[in-house]
């Protein structure tokens, strides 16, 4: 019996040697093999010289082969598809001379830290290039100059802080660009040129909205139907455009497209199309905590196949998913044109949710199943995932308040006693003076700790008479199935086991589409501001009031008129009754 299974597809002999515990190439491979599957073996190293006699070979699949090195000295003149995903490659050799016919190259989920300028030299037929989920911190100028026929490019979930100007020059046929989940703060002026680019993914970056973002903002305004939010398992063509998924990290996650840009010089090419009224901004101090079980476990769900640790990829999110409905078992399903992701993860927008749903993920990997999603739970009942008390990170975000005289307090229950039970929000009460509130600064490990100091961002705040505070109480008793308002006692943070989040009711600066995150894995602002620990610029914070039409109509309290007092979303006193995830 031969080592591998043989079949034929579209006139090509297909040889399947997947998961055969091979440490080297089988000796009995058919000479006329056209498609060769070697995935899920333990090859360690691979060279094109192994296959030089396989003159019909057009597709070669080497994913999950524990590859640490690849050599491409011998020519495989007919090879069109090369899948090297989910390996341990730290560098990519020049493939152009050996593989001139290559049309699809997948090197996703490896450990590529950089690419040489000539890495793609000679790959003039390349149509699809997948580099997502690596450790790429920068790209060399002219990287894509040789690949003029490129249709699909994925650079998602890397550590890119900037993109080289002209990266896309000459890529006239490019139709899909994945840039989500990086550390990008802006897009170079003229970056998109005149490219049509029907599908672009830009969410989950640290976009910094200042005058330098105007080119990008204008491009978003002019191309709102080209910007999409990644949904796992959904074909790109079936997704709906979502330009609001691109958010300003420094402006309370306001959509970049609506950034006013007031006071910026109106240069040719990034004309300020919008004329918004001047709005005050406030400074926010964000202190990140790390090394918690809840933190690690949650990211573990996203990073099951990532080659780097969760903590080293603070913002490098994979395509965003819905909370898992059960504890994950990392079986994988192939997604055409994209690399595999755990199939327990459903598509979601945890980072930038535009729907309002109840989170269902328990961060701790216990045997208990995560809370099932109630069919029609009111919005006020959104529970926070249950971490262990000792593992809850402390996050302090003081914000200056215009009218701090009597700001309400929200106690959000952390524990959901039963899957069916619904927590009870408490009636707000005034909080004590801010001086009595502990605000520890817990440093976050940085990718390059030796060279990068950990700054704390100064917070110029007026002396408020009463600072608002959100606190998280101890687990609530078993509540009834309907939310009930109760009169609480004053709750103050007592130890670092409880996250205290200081936020204020700032008058709305922009009225834009921003609904609650669909899951709250750690604390809300830690998720929204999962930045590289050394923040490049001071974060500015504004509270954005969601538009009524952007929310799930079943879950939103309806108002009969749109006056501030009758519409709960326009009522400044109403803000703090909502669960923290709503903001």
């Amino acid at each position: 019996q031969p080592t591998c299974d043989v079949s034929k597809v579209t006139s090509l002999l297909e040889v399947n040697c997947e998961d055969k515990k091979l440490k080297k190439l089988p000796t009995d491979l058919p000479a006329d093999t056209g498609i060769l599957h070697l995935s899920k073996n333990q090859l360690g190293t691979f060279s094109t010289s192994y296959l030089v006699h396989f003159t019909h070979l057009t597709h070669l699949y080497l994913s999950r082969c524990e590859l640490t090195s690849l050599q491409a000295h011998e020519k495989l003149l007919k090879l069109e598809t090369l899948d090297l995903s989910h390996n341990h490659l730290q560098s990519l050799p020049s493939l152009g001379r050996a593989l001139p016919a290559l049309t699809t190259l997948d090197v996703s989920f490896n450990k590529l830290g950089s690419l040489s300028p000539g890495a793609l030299e000679g790959l003039g037929q390349l149509e699809e290039l997948y580099l997502q989920n690596n450790d790429l911190k920068s790209l060399p100028p002219g990287l894509l100059m040789p690949t003029t026929k490129l249709l699909k490019l994925s650079l998602a979930n890397n550590k890119l802080r900037e993109l080289p100007p002209g990266l896309l020059d000459g890529l006239e046929d490019l139709d899909t660009l994945y840039l989500q989940g990086n550390w990008l703060s802006t897009i170079p002026k003229g970056f998109f040129g005149s490219l049509l680019l029907p599908f672009v993914f830009l969410h989950a970056n640290t976009w910094y909205c200042d005058c330098e973002i105007l080119y990008f903002r204008n491009w978003l305004q002019e191309n709102p139907n080209r910007v999409y939010l990644w949904k796992e398992g959904v074909d790109v063509k079936a997704m709906t455009a979502n330009v609001a998924s691109v958010r300003c990290a420094n402006l309370g996650n306001a959509p970049v497209y609506s950034y006013p840009g007031k006071g910026c010089p109106t240069n040719e090419g990034d004309i300020d199309y919008d004329d918004y009224a001047d709005t005050p901004t406030t400074r926010t101090e964000v202190k990140f905590s790390t090394n918690t079980k809840a933190h690690t476990t949650y990211w573990g769900l996203f990073y099951s196949e990532s080659s780097t640790s969760p903590d080293s990829q603070m913002t490098s999110l994979p395509p965003i998913h819905e909370p898992t409905k059960k504890q994950p078992t990392f079986a994988h399903t192939e997604i055409p044109g994209f690399t595999t992701l755990p199939d327990t993860m459903e598509s979601n927008t945890a980072f930038y949710s535009l729907n309002n749903t109840v989170p269902t993920t328990t961060p701790e990997p216990t045997s208990t199943q995560a809370t099932p999603e109630p069919s029609s739970t009111p919005m006020l009942t959104t529970p926070v995932p249950t971490p262990e008390p000792s593992s809850i990170p402390m996050l302090t975000v003081p914000v200056s308040t215009p009218e701090p005289s009597s700001t309400p307090m929200l106690t959000t229950p952390v524990s959901t006693p039963e899957p069916s039970s619904i927590p009870m929000p408490t009636i707000p009460v005034p909080t004590p003076e801010p001086s009595s509130i502990p605000m520890p600064t817990i440093p976050v490990p940085t990718p390059e700790p030796s060279s990068t100091p950990m700054p704390t961002i100064p917070v110029p705040t007026p002396e408020p008479s009463s600072t608002p505070m959100f606190t998280t109480p101890v687990p609530t008793p078993e509540p009834s199935s309907t939310p009930m308002l109760t009169t609480p006692t004053l709750t103050t943070p007592e130890s670092s086991s409880t996250p205290s989040i200081l936020v204020s009711t700032i008058p709305p600066v922009l009225t834009t589409t921003l609904a609650p995150p669909e899951s709250i894995p750690k604390t809300v602002l830690e998720q929204f501001y999962t930045l590289e620990p050394t923040l490049p610029r001071t974060l500015e914070s504004t509270i954005i009031i969601p538009e009524q039409n952007s929310l799930n109509s079943q879950a939103v309290p309806q108002a009969s008129s749109d006056t501030p007092k009758s519409n709960p979303f326009l009522n400044s006193d109403f803000c703090c009754l909502l669960p923290l995830g709503f903001y």
């Epitope: 597809v9 579209t10 006139s11 006329d32 093999t33």
Partner: antibody, heavy 118, light 113 residues
Framework: QVQLVESGGGLVKPGGSLRLSCAAS????????MSWIRQAPGKGLEWVSS???????YYPDSVLGRFTISRDNAKNSLYLQMNSLRAEDTAVYYC????????????WGQGTLVTVSS | DIQMTQSPSSLSASVGDRVTITCKSS????????????LAWYQQKPGKAPKLLIY???TRESGVPSRFSGSGSGTDFTLTISSLQPEDFATYYC?????????FGQGTKVEIK
């Protein structure tokens, strides 16, 4: 002209073995993939096995491990070794040629009947 | 495996009639790389071996009369005999040659009315 002539059919008991042959002429045998296709009495066509011009065999699950296809290019012959025969293997067995690397069958033999019965 | 379903299983027609036989596959037979649909049609007369009529959905084998034509894409295919001739009374089979195992439809028997 292309000719394919099958032989070796007959009556065999369940569990028994039989070897079919197909003599090819009128074309460069070594350059073509060859196949066996069968047709149970009064039924439709069912693919049994193929062998590429380079000699790589492949089979459907229904016969995998029981049937073995082979070729002898020097003799312009195709073979099908059938072991562990079952009643459901009863059929007319056709030898057929494939066009190039494609997998439709442009020439067929007249067929040989294999009957598996106790 | 790809399942092939032909309809009707039999039909009665007269000489000169236009006859249409359909074949459905359980998955697409379109190869996006070359835009070809991997479907073939055969004619078989009683006691004889099948004869190739059409491959790649619509390409007529040499020597096959022009009254035979094939069409379709993806999962739905049609064999049309524009004007039925006496020698066309036979059983017709479709076959997918997209991926092994190669599978055939159950056949459509065209009988004289």
């Amino acid at each position: 002209q292309v000719q394919l002539v099958e032989s070796g059919g007959g009556l065999v008991k369940p569990g028994g073995s039989l070897r079919l042959s197909c003599a090819a002429s009128g074309f460069t045998f070594s350059s073509f993939a060859m196949s066996w296709i069968r047709q149970a009495p009064g039924k439709g066509l069912e693919w049994v096995s193929s062998i590429t011009s380079a000699g790589t065999p492949y089979y459907p699950d229904s016969v995998l491990g029981r049937f073995t296809i082979s070729r002898d290019n020097a003799k312009n012959s195709l073979y099908l070794q059938m072991n562990s025969l079952r009643a459901e293997d009863t059929a007319v067995y056709y030898c057929a040629r494939s066009r190039g690397y494609e997998d439709y069958f442009d020439y067929w033999g007249q067929g040989t009947l294999v009957t598996v019965s106790s | 495996d790809i399942q092939m379903t032909q309809s009707p299983s039999s039909l009665s027609a007269s000489v000169g009639d236009r006859v249409t036989i359909t074949c459905k596959s359980s998955q697409s037979l379109l190869n996006s790389r070359n835009q070809k649909n991997y479907l073939a049609w055969y004619q078989q007369k009683p006691g004889k071996a099948p004869k190739l009529l059409i491959y790649f959905t619509s390409t007529r084998e040499s020597g096959v009369p022009s009254r035979f034509s094939g069409s379709g894409s993806g999962t739905d295919f049609t064999l049309t005999i524009s004007s039925l001739q006496p020698e066309d009374f036979a059983t017709y089979y479709c076959q997918q040659h997209y991926s092994s195992p190669w599978t055939f439809g159950q056949g459509t028997k065209v009988e004289i009315k």
